[in-house]
């Protein structure tokens, strides 16, 4: 039975040109995390595998950095980065857990006065 839950940073906003950390945390399970996939809509951004380490999509090689931890850092944000991001935790023996984050990339002046939660 799958007992775990994924906690995410939820809905976040960031400034155009800035950086943001996408973070998920799997709790309430003793299952072993074998791999975490980070996806944007249907596009694979990065993989962190327990054996093979981090591998980043060539399409994002200059704008995505691994970590911290199992999280992902997006850099040089553009308005086109606005959208849904998914952390997909592959675990044994539980199976797959998926977390969702919605990122809104705003023009600088808007982001400065936004009331949304933002990771520093």
């Amino acid at each position: 039975m799958m007992t775990g839950t994924i906690e995410t940073t939820g809905n976040i906003s960031a400034e155009k040109g800035g950086s943001i950390i996408l973070q998920c945390h799997l709790s309430s399970t003793t299952a072993q995390v074998t791999q975490v996939n980070w996806e944007q809509q249907d596009q694979l951004l990065a993989i962190c595998n327990a054996d093979l380490g981090w591998h980043i999509s060539p399409s994002f090689k200059d704008r995505v950095a691994p970590g911290p931890g199992l999280g992902l850092t997006l850099q040089s944000l553009t308005v086109n980065d606005t959208g849904e991001y998914f952390c997909i935790y592959h675990t044994y023996p539980d199976g797959t857990y998926t977390g969702r984050i919605f990122l809104e990339v705003l023009e600088s002046s808007v982001a400065e006065h936004g009331a949304r939660f933002q990771i520093p």
Epitope: Q35, Q43, L44
Partner: antibody, heavy 120, light 107 residues
Framework: EVQLVQSGAEVKKPGASVKVSCKAS????????MHWVRQAPGQGLEWMGL????????GYNRKFKGRVTMTRDTSTSTVYMELSSLRSEDTAVYYC?????????????WGQGTLVTVSS | DIVMTQSPSSLSASVGDRVTITCKAS??????VAWYQQKPGKSPKLLIY???NRYTGVPDRFSGSGSGTDFTLTISSLQPEDFATYFC?????????FGGGTKVEIK
């Protein structure tokens, strides 16, 4: 036209090492992952690992960890796969294969294969 | 590791036949499945990726379907050049793994 040209057949004794090369042309070498897949005579396909020429990042199938090393030379657009402590079960055709553009973990172009025979 | 169980391991068919090859994953791989064709003494060639996307230049008689754990490669009307061995591959989880292959022979 994308081409992956591999080095010639090798005959090795048990315990020895072999280094197979794969020269890429027809695309930007550092924009795509390269994988190595082997096929024993009359058998299926077995994934060995990958190397990212952009930053020399590697990841190996745990079955081969400690015995396999994948490297790249950006000046010649060539990747290498070295397998050590050879045994008879390593007799196979070894292929380099380029990771796809939308996801680097399927293979859109393959080398012609290099037969490695391990025999005393 | 994810096990890809391919069936049948071989089949005999005639030109013009509709051929279906199946691949079952030991766990959910969503749609991260590719299909390859390999002829004797040659390298594999990509046919299908993302379970159902036909690769550039692949004839439309080849189609792929499925998601989760069950996947199918269909050749709608078998041609003489289609006699070969076909492999499925999952690319959701490392290590990447292949099915055992299906050899399509002339009846």
């Amino acid at each position: 036209e994308v081409q992956l040209v591999q080095s010639g057949a090798e005959v090795k004794k048990p315990g020895a090492s072999v280094k197979v090369s794969c020269k890429a042309s027809g695309y930007t070498f550092t924009d795509y992952y390269m994988h190595w897949v082997r096929q024993a005579p009359g058998q299926g396909l077995e994934w060995m690992g990958l190397v990212y020429p952009y930053n020399d990042n590697t990841g190996y199938n745990r079955k081969f960890k400690g015995r396999v090393t994948m490297t790249r030379d950006t000046s010649t657009s060539t990747v290498y796969m070295e397998l050590s402590s050879l045994r008879s079960e390593d007799t196979a055709v070894y292929y380099c294969a380029r990771g796809g553009p939308s996801n680097w973990n399927y293979f859109d172009y393959w080398g012609q294969g290099t037969l490695v025979t391990v025999s005393s | 590791d994810i096990v890809m169980t391919q069936s049948p391991s071989s089949l005999s068919a005639s030109v013009g036949d509709r051929v279906t090859i199946t691949c079952k994953a030991s766990q959910n791989v969503v749609t991260a499945v590719a299909w390859y064709q390999q002829k004797p003494g040659k390298s594999p060639k990509l046919l299908i990726y993302s379970a159902s996307n036909r690769y550039t230049g692949v004839p439309d008689r080849f189609s792929g379907s499925g998601s989760g754990t069950d996947f199918t490669l269909t050749i709608s009307s078998l041609q003489p050049e289609d006699f070969a061995t076909y492999f499925c591959q999952q690319y959701t989880l490392y290590p990447l793994t292949f099915g055992g292959g299906t050899k399509v022979e002339i009846k």
